[in-house]
Interface confidence: medium
């Protein structure tokens, strides 16, 4: 995992790390997450219910890192050294959108604004942490 830098102003009053319990997000390179996640879900159960909507897309295999990307938002990596959830970096989002949005559109689903790539940190953004996908994800 390659991680950018951290903006300390965004890290007040964080909840403790918890084990990843969402089936889709197990075995992707990290084991701990934190709620609320980057989409505002307050529990893993709530996140898992929404994440399930993407299961057919993950199974379709439109992008090799789609599962990792989705999990970085719905069950973001947590470490005791950093008090904010850590999302994927923007390039991974853009690659996933490029490959998967056309598939979604075939079924009358748009790429949701909650997954808006422009809202994610770039790899070298000095004000936010973000993750690159591991080679084996």
């Amino acid at each position: 995992l390659e991680i950018g830098r951290f903006d300390p102003e965004r890290g007040r009053g964080a909840a403790p790390c918890q084990a990843v319990e969402i089936p889709m997000c197990r075995g992707i390179g990290y084991n701990l997450t934190r709620m609320p996640n980057l989409l505002g879900h307050t529990s893993q159960g709530e996140a898992a219910a929404e994440l399930a909507e993407f299961a057919p897309l993950v199974q379709y295999g439109c992008h090799s890192h789609l599962r990792f990307f989705l999990c970085s938002l719905y069950a973001p990596m947590c470490t005791d050294q950093v008090s904010t959830p850590i999302p994927a970096c923007r390039p991974m989002c853009e690659q996933a959108r490029l490959r998967c949005a056309p598939i979604m559109e075939q079924f009358n689903f748009g790429w949701p604004d909650s997954l808006d790539c422009a809202r994610l940190p770039t790899r070298n953004d000095p004000h936010a942490l973000c993750m690159e996908a591991p080679e084996n994800a």
Partner: antibody, heavy 127, light 107 residues
Framework: QVQLVQSGAEVKKPGASVKVSCKAS????????MHWVRQAPGQGLEWMGW????????KFAPKFQGRVTMTRDTSTSTVYMELSSLRSEDTAVYYC????????????????????WGQGTTVTVSS | EIVLTQSPATLSVSPGERATLSCRAS??????LAWYQQKPGQAPRLLIY???TRATGIPARFSGSGSGTEFTLTISSLQSEDFAVYYC?????????FGPGTKVDIK
């Protein structure tokens, strides 16, 4: 206190461009997206787009794509909206609006409502 | 583009009465809906976000409800300062869109 102060009224001729400024104060400028919304006389509200003051990234409504530019100056905590190729239908009050950041932990990723608005800038396009 | 429809277009209410405003979306917003109040010559003011959460400083007489495609703003007992135009807005998908507004005037 948190506030957004916009530049003064403008009168422009068709085909010209207008640049409206919005100066933020009372909060960390780079922590919240800034949006622009316009309102034609007697009409409703129309979203134009947003800028991420942290990175400079922008996103526009398809209707304005290619005609609108949004920029920011972090040294003065000011965002700018420039609209080109003006026509009479662009006569409106233009508002900047701060996107709320109700949970600093989830921040930018999740879209949110507009909690602070500028006072508005009247742009009149007339020949 | 998500289309928001507000009803009624105009609502005539007496002070002290209850006002119920409706906003319908052309597709599901989950709870990504806000309500704004606008008075003549003023900028809009955020009342409700997340469909049901009151913004800071908003009186308890304002309440929001609903999810998915059907949303309601209720003003439990109208005060003189509540007569204004009310807009709903969705921020689930770009382009973010507003409803056409409901004007609440004095009966």
């Amino acid at each position: 206190q948190v506030q957004l102060v916009q530049s003064g009224a403008e009168v422009k001729k068709p085909g010209a461009s207008v640049k409206v400024s919005c100066k933020a104060s009372g909060y960390t400028f780079t922590n919240n997206f800034m949006h622009w919304v316009r309102q034609a006389p007697g009409q409703g509200l129309e979203w134009m787009g947003w800028i991420n003051p942290n990175s400079g990234d922008t996103k526009f409504a398809p209707k304005f794509q290619g005609r609108v530019t949004m920029t920011r100056d972090t040294s003065t905590s000011t965002v700018y909206m420039e609209l080109s190729s003006l026509r009479s239908e662009d006569t409106a009050v233009y508002y900047c609006a701060r996107e709320a950041n109700y949970d600093i932990l989830t921040g930018y990723i999740r879209p949110d409502a507009f909690d602070i608005w500028g006072q508005g800038t009247t742009v009149t396009v007339s020949s | 583009e998500i289309v928001l429809t507000q009803s009624p277009a105009t609502l005539s209410v007496s002070p002290g009465e209850r006002a119920t405003l409706s906003c319908r979306a052309s597709q599901s917003l989950r709870s990504k809906l806000a309500w704004y109040q606008q008075k003549p010559g003023q900028a809009p003011r955020l009342l409700i976000y997340g469909a049901s959460t009151r913004a800071t400083g908003i009186p308890a007489r304002f309440s929001g409800s609903g999810s998915g495609t059907e949303f309601t703003l209720t003003i439990s007992s109208l005060q003189s300062e509540d007569f204004a135009v009310y807009y709903c807005q969705q921020y689930a998908n770009s382009p973010w869109t507003f409803g056409p507004g409901t004007k609440v005037d004095i009966k």
